[in-house]
Interface confidence: medium
């Protein structure tokens, strides 16, 4: 059945509440000078607007510190309200190592973001931290990289092995919880010329991840004890027509080209997913496609196995699909899908449709697929165009965690957590954001608040209290860190 | 330290079987192949096959298969090798080792080698 | 399988000079941008050690002298200077397919 009656109960007291940001800019300088330049000022307020030294007068300074950044403080302030155990967002690469490679490190940027995770920490936040956070527009990688044919050129999974080595030596003793790219399966995106380019690009990606992976196994892990993943966008295929047999089938090979194409390799066998070779081939030998997906060596796929310690996934609606066979050499066309918008059913102004049990299907075929391992909801979320009443996204927020309740107690699903998108919105973008561009919270928020501490939906009499050992403990040791360790 | 400790020497007769093993430590044993490389005096280095502690899997060089057999043990860290129907040929120096972490395959840490001597 | 021939067997070279090895597969050990070719050095009574990976990259710990070149199907291994404790045994190994398989070794005696 799709719904089934709301349950109650709770999530598990180590269960991660999370908002999830997107790249965050670092700031490039403190914005207090007053605390480190000792010179007094008068503003020329009336004549030319300028500053002016006042000669011969001399103010004590005070060292730079992490609330001298102007953002941060916007950041916490919005972290405070959310009442969330974890905050998800992402470094920018192209900010911390411009050159591409580890001769030019950006140190005021790693401080920033060290400021980040260690004011977060001190609210009792903890971090998620994203190295790679491409979006549609930009692929936010170093110029340099950019130039040299980006993800289509191998050696661009080196440079993200150096760039993921220098954050986890910089962060890794405060972050616990590292995702290396957000939804590479979604750079078919721009990566769309032709579907060899989408799928060479893909395979650079997935080697970047598992090198990056290894990386830390090796080195960062005995020391930080951290866990390393990769998130992936995973919408649920559902068929537009639940009688026809090619409907079904076109679902299934969404998921497979869609979230297979990525977990295949790296949760299971080191190689892409069979049923997508075969169809790719079959296409290829009648003429209908020249795509190919890349042959991995021995070497590779001993590379790519296992790279996971848990399952990340973005979640945010449910897709209607149906068979319709495409010519032409490109991703979209090798799957032979197409997409069925269903007015019927409750959608956003970007026409994403609510569909909670979508997220629960979801979670038990990542189960049957791939295995009992810990699985995290990184991102979900809808866009509501209210700037205070965000009806549309409190109807949503309750629904989908009512639905992956129901996969924890249920199913016995062994979800971990789960990060709303997102923390605020962008100005002229689709309204993602619990507080506007300018700062100002939604209704929304008090709605998260209270499923955040009932740990759920709670039975009248039962106690959402957790003991100090049960609640999220992964970084005990951070907040000592944050004070001993110089910034 | 990363250096897998292998059981000592074994001296075994003709027809015989012969089980030598490789304790992990200092990394974590489910992520990383054991490789099993055979060195017979005055010749090369030969490679027998792989095991991945994680899910068991293996491959073998064809010219092992049935003749050596790869498990481990995910409790103990330890993996095995044991060698079946044994001949004077089998008489040799088994090494395990650890893949490195690239996916380059090439081996980065050596046991110190067992010596398996078969004789009547 | 892919059968690697190392050239010569054995060579002598005098402390300081340099010290080449050649290792010939029978067909390329090169894709997608890597070449899966890795050198290992052995002393007697000693487990291998690598020296070498992926044709050119120099395993932490192992000492500048040694340089890896090579794609496809040639690939050299060169000490310079050489050491008096370089004395050993060396083996290319591929790992671009099963069964990985070394080279025969080529036996470094210095003088």
């Known amino acids: 059945k799709e719904s089934t009656p709301d349950v109650q109960g709770q999530f598990p007291c180590d269960f991660s509440w999370g908002v999830t940001e997107s790249v965050l800019k670092p700031e490039s300088v403190a914005s207090s000078p007053q605390f480190s330049d000792p010179h007094l000022y008068v503003w020329n307020a009336t004549g030319n607007r300028l500053l002016h030294r006042v000669e011969g007068v001399r103010l004590k300074t005070r060292p730079a510190q992490c609330t001298d950044f102007v953002n941060i403080k916007k950041q916490l302030e919005m972290l405070a309200r959310m009442k969330v155990t974890h905050y998800r967002f992402a470094l920018d690469w192209a900010s911390v190592l411009p050159t591409g490679n580890l001769s030019a490190v950006n140190r005021q940027a790693l401080r920033y973001y060290r400021c980040v995770v260690s004011e977060g920490l001190k609210l009792g936040i903890s971090a998620m931290v994203t190295l790679y956070y491409p979006t549609h527009a930009h692929l936010g990688l170093p110029e340099p990289l950019l130039h040299a044919d980006g993800w289509l050129n191998p050696s661009t999974a080196e440079a993200f092995q150096a760039y993921a080595g220098l954050c986890f030596q910089e962060l890794g003793d405060l972050v616990k919880l590292w995702i290396t790219i957000n939804e590479p399966n979604r750079l078919s995106d721009i990566y769309n010329r032709s579907g060899n380019d989408t799928y060479g690009a893909a395979h650079n990606l997935l080697v970047a991840h598992a090198l990056a992976w290894r990386l830390y196994d090796r080195q960062f892990r005995p020391s930080q004890r951290g866990a390393v993943s990769l998130s992936l966008h995973a919408d649920w295929a559902e068929p537009a027509n639940p009688y026809a047999d090619s409907h079904w089938r076109a679902a299934e090979r969404f998921l497979q080209f869609e979230i297979a194409w990525f977990a295949e390799p790296l949760f299971k066998t080191g190689d892409y997913p069979a049923a997508m070779r075969e169809y790719i081939a079959s296409k290829h030998r009648r003429g209908l496609s020249s795509s190919a997906l890349p042959r991995l060596t021995e070497a590779e796929r001993r590379l790519l196995k296992g790279t996971v310690d848990f399952c990340a996934l973005n979640h945010f609606t449910t897709r209607f699909v149906m068979h319709e066979q495409l010519a032409g050499s490109r991703y979209d066309s090798d799957r032979d899908i197409q997409f069925l918008q269903d007015i019927t059913r409750l959608s956003s102004p970007t026409r994403l449709a609510v569909i909670p049990w979508g997220v629960r299907k979801l979670l038990r075929w990542v189960r049957r697929n791939y295995g009992d391992m810990d699985i995290y909801i990184t991102a979900s979320g809808i866009d509501d165009q209210a700037l205070e009443d965000d009806r549309l996204r409190k109807y949503y927020l309750g629904k989908y965690l009512q639905e992956v309740l129901k996969a924890y107690l249920i199913d016995k699903v062994r979800i971990k957590g789960y990060y709303a998108f997102k923390l605020a919105e962008e100005k002229s973008k689709p309204r993602f954001g619990f507080f506007t561009s300018d700062f100002k919270a939604k209704s929304s928020i008090q709605f998260y608040n209270k499923v955040i501490s009932s740990r759920g939906f709670p039975f009248e009499n039962s106690s959402s209290r957790c003991s100090q050992t049960q609640e999220n403990t992964e970084c005990t040791v951070c907040l000592f860190l944050v004070q001993k360790k110089p910034l | 330290q990363v250096q897998p400790q292998e059981s000592g020497p074994e001296l075994v007769k003709p027809g015989a079987l012969v089980k030598i093993s490789c304790k992990a430590s200092?990394?974590?044993?489910?992520?990383?192949?054991i490789n099993w490389v055979k060195k017979r005096p005055g010749q090369g280095l030969e490679w027998i096959g792989w095991i991945y502690p994680g899910d068991g899997s293996t491959k073998y060089n064809e010219k092992f298969e049935g003749k050596a057999t790869l498990t481990a043990d995910k409790s103990s860290s330890t993996a095995y090798m044991q060698l079946s129907s044994l001949t004077s040929e089998n008489s040799a120096v088994y090494f395990c080792a650890r893949s490195d972490y690239y996916g380059s395959r090439s081996f980065v840490y050596w046991g110190q080698g067992t010596l398996v001597t078969v004789s009547a | 399988d892919i059968v690697l021939t190392q050239s010569p067997d054995s060579l002598t070279v005098s402390l300081g000079q340099r010290a080449t090895i050649s290792c010939r597969a029978s067909?390329?050990?090169?894709?997608?941008?890597?070449?899966?070719m890795h050198w290992y050095q052995q002393k007697p009574g000693q487990p291998p050690k690598l020296l070498i990976y992926?044709?050119?990259n120099l395993e932490s710990g192992v000492p500048a002298r040694f340089s890896g070149s090579g794609s496809g199907t040639d690939f050299t291994l060169n000490i310079h200077p050489v050491e008096e404790e370089d004395a050993a045994t060396y083996y290319c190994q591929h790992s671009r397919e099963l069964p990985y398989t070394f080279g025969g070794g080529t036996k470094l005696e210095i003088k």
């Open positions: 067909k390329s050990v090169s894709t997608s941008g890597y070449s899966y």
């Open positions: 992926l044709a050119s």
């Open positions: 200092g990394y974590t044993f489910t992520r990383y192949d």
